[in-house]
């Protein structure tokens, strides 16, 4: 590939509130299933449609989720983020880094597992 | 865009066995949760079996006999069947969708996935 893919990273509070199936996403990653390389953060990986993180529509495919209502997500298992989320209650505070694919020179290809989402 | 082929279908007698088959496309195969589907004729698709990183989870109808796995390596996951019975004749579907949900999972809504393969034909007589 020529040219070269810069990524612009923008940090963001997202407030969401449980919907009636909760709070309408998935996510990958931890310290034992690294999506994306010598990371072990938790990335979104499907917005569920008309759910809560739809229609609040600021989170993203390829998000990296920071912290869930102050509580690092640095170190932990799948399924302890998993459950950290169920548990997170009714208003849900996601700390959030968006990574913006920033173009340079020719188009490029974005593989599966690449943040950028 | 993850593209699914299912294989192992075919026929049997009452009381036999197959392995049905799911290949996935993608290099992060290991984070999908994988479902399998199942429709008769003048039938609405029902729920089977799932694996997700938490486990397996199976229809009432098919616990005991029905097995769910996955080899991470080939990225694939299979159904073995078991003491297989006329009425689970049908067109097998497998499902996936990319990570675990953040909320109650629900292996049995066919909303929680994303992608579907062709299916393959078992025939119980």
């Known amino acids: 590939m020529n040219g070269r893919v810069d990524y612009l990273v923008t940090e963001e509070e997202i407030n969401l509130t449980r919907g009636p199936s909760g709070l309408g996403f998935n996510i990958v990653g931890g310290t034992d299933q690294q999506y994306v390389s010598n990371d072990s953060g938790i990335y979104v990986s499907r917005i569920k449609e008309n759910g809560a993180a739809a229609l609040d529509g600021r989170l993203q495919e390829g998000d990296k989720i920071l912290s869930v209502n102050g509580q690092d997500l640095k170190n932990l298992l799948h399924q302890d983020a998993v459950d950290l989320f169920r548990n997170a209650g009714y208003a849900v505070s996601l700390r959030v880094q968006h990574r913006l694919q920033v173009q340079n020179g020719p188009i490029g290809h974005r593989g599966e597992g690449d943040p950028s989402g | 865009e993850v593209q699914l082929v299912e294989s192992g279908g075919g026929s049997v007698q009452a009381g036999g066995s197959l392995r049905l088959s799911c290949t996935a496309s993608g290099r992060t195969f290991s984070t999908y949760t994988m479902a399998w589907f199942r429709q008769a004729p003048g039938k609405e698709r029902e729920f089977v079996a799932a694996?997700?990183?938490?486990?397996?989870y199976y229809a009432d109808s098919v616990t005991g006999r029905f097995t769910i796995s996955r080899d991470n390596a080939k990225n694939t996951v299979y159904l073995q069947m078991n003491s297989l019975k006329p009425e689970d004749t049908a067109v097998y579907y497998c499902?996936?969708?990319?990570?675990?949900?953040?909320?109650?999972?629900?292996?049995?809504?066919?909303?929680?996935?994303?992608?579907w393969g062709q299916g393959t034909q078992v025939t119980v007589s």
């Open positions: 499902a996936a969708v990319i990570g675990s949900t953040v909320d109650s999972y629900r292996p049995g809504d066919h909303l929680e996935y994303d992608y």
């Open positions: 694996i997700s990183w938490s486990g397996a």
